[in-house]
Amino acid sequence: LEASEEVELEPCLAPSLEQQEQELTVALGQPVRLCCGRAERGGHWYKEGSRLAPAGRVRGWRGRLEIASFLPEDAGRYLCLARGSMIVLQNLTLITGDSLTSSNDDEDPKSHRDPSNRHSYPQQAPYWTHPQRMEKKLHAVPAGNTVKFRCPAAGNPTPTIRWLKDGQAFHGENRIGGIRLRHQHWSLVMESVVPSDRGTYTCLVENAVGSIRYNYLLDVLERSPHRPILQAGLPANTTAVVGSDVELLCKVYSDAQPHIQWLKHIVINGSSFGADGFPYVQVLKTADINSSEVEVLYLRNVSAEDAGEYTCLAGNSIGLSYQSAWLTVLPEEDPTWTAAAPEARYTD
């Protein structure tokens, strides 16, 4: 929605008694006008348990919810209850436009209650406010990573949250590094997870009316030391025409810091191998993985002399891996000629 547009649910007609929970995203500064029930007999609007006054920047008036200019603190849950009864006519959550795209999902709107307001809506058992943030149930996380579980909920009275691990109360006292419980964000954070953190994490959300629970299943994957893994098929055999540019690609995966070299196989005194049995090579490029574009070997304006075998060699503290490919260079005048190159080699 553009900031200039007004958010409207529908004209103030007779209410639907099958009003489903809705979520509306509103841009900051945008006016909001939501209706509930007929104008004269419109319902009462409540925000986070407090009845809205008929005057002010955010007001509930003759069945209408009106916000002159939407601000971050206006985000939250709004209910419209029928006059003279506890029937919910509207049940919706307003979200600030940024909050859906923000990568920091900690910024949940806080409840803004007016303690002097005595018109509170009826008691309600806990319910999940953002179930879409809880959809990922099974977690497989490498050791050392940070894990965050969230169970955003609401209810009236405001529910409390407790965490269990494998069915037992969990406060993190036996965990190196402890845990961070952020009750206002309904979250549990564990930094630098280790295998002993594996298990079932249950958030238990309770108030006087009822309780709900949700399980997260956590697996911690041990980092098994291995030498670099090179993606199969890379570098690939390549055919190029004299004068063209060539790129050879090598994809390297390694937990331990890898070191990469690009080598060209050369012939010395008519031989490709030295007395030690190793091939003669010329080092074309060498760097660590975090160097920019180290995994690509660029050959500019290739000539017939550039033809031959090229090797991507990757090593770390555990060992070496390499894969090779052939570059065939065709003369400019006869681009239809092709030569069968040997298959690329893949070694462990």
Epitope: P131, K136, K137, L138, A140, R198, T202, L217, L218
Partner: antibody, heavy 118, light 112 residues
């Protein structure tokens, strides 16, 4: 391409034991949650057990708790189900399935039939 | 008896729209996403819908899923003879006994 191939089914007497295997390929087995689901002849699907990628966490249906054990050998890309104290009601086709992070079984094996009968 | 409740059978004629319901409780469908599986005669089940309404690649958009509260439904529009199969809903259950997967009893869909 993800492939799951069950084996080890057969006829066994009540009170007997059987071990099912599921050979996996086409994905990083050691990171994947895996599960067993069974289907009695002419009946619906019933979840049996699940295991985390590391093997450090296991889960069971109440109907098999204490009798069945799920395990895995990541070096062999193989999932197992050790079934002890078998009963007639354990007769079913047993499917091996990969669990995705949202909790769904996104790939299934073709199943292996276990018959418990005297 | 299955934890999730489905009608045992459903039917429709080619081209019709058919809906299959799945009812649960707050500890399963109410808190967890719903998945749907199709089992063609004599074959293994296949994932049809995950995360309430998401289709895996290769599943036609004639199949759609939805969830509201503690119930879910699978809709099949433009019914075809090859849709004749058993359909199962499933969800994780977070009851006091610990996590478990629960299935519906299955709905046998007949294309008339």
């Amino acid at each position: 391409e993800v492939q799951l191939l069950e084996s080890g089914g057969g006829l066994v007497q009540p009170g007997g034991s059987l071990r099912l295997s599921c050979a996996a390929s086409g994905f990083t087995f050691s990171k994947a949650w895996m599960s067993w689901v069974r289907q009695a002849p002419g009946k619906g699907l019933e979840w049996v057990s699940a295991i985390s990628g590391s093997g450090g966490s296991t889960y069971y249906a109440d109907s098999v708790k204490g009798r069945f054990t799920i395990s895995r050998d990541n070096s062999k890309n193989t999932l197992y189900l050790q079934m002890n104290s078998l009963r007639a009601e354990d007769t079913a086709v047993y499917y091996c399935a990969r669990l995705y992070s949202y909790g769904d079984f996104d790939h299934w094996g073709q199943g292996t039939l276990v018959t418990v009968s005297s | 008896q299955s934890v999730l409740t489905q009608p045992p059978s459903a039917s429709g004629t080619p081209g019709q729209r058919v809906t299959i319901s799945c009812s649960g409780s707050s500890s399963n469908i109410g808190s967890n996403t719903v998945n749907w599986y199709q089992q063609l005669p004599g074959t293994a089940p296949k994932l049809l819908i995950y995360r309430n309404n998401q289709r895996p690649s290769g599943v036609p958009d004639r199949f759609s899923g939805s969830k509201s509260g503690t119930s879910a439904s699978l809709a099949i529009s433009g019914l075809r003879s090859e849709d004749e199969a058993d359909y199962y809903c499933a969800a994780w259950d977070d009851s006091l006994n610990g996590p478990a997967v629960v299935f519906g009893g299955g709905t046998k869909l007949t294309v008339l």
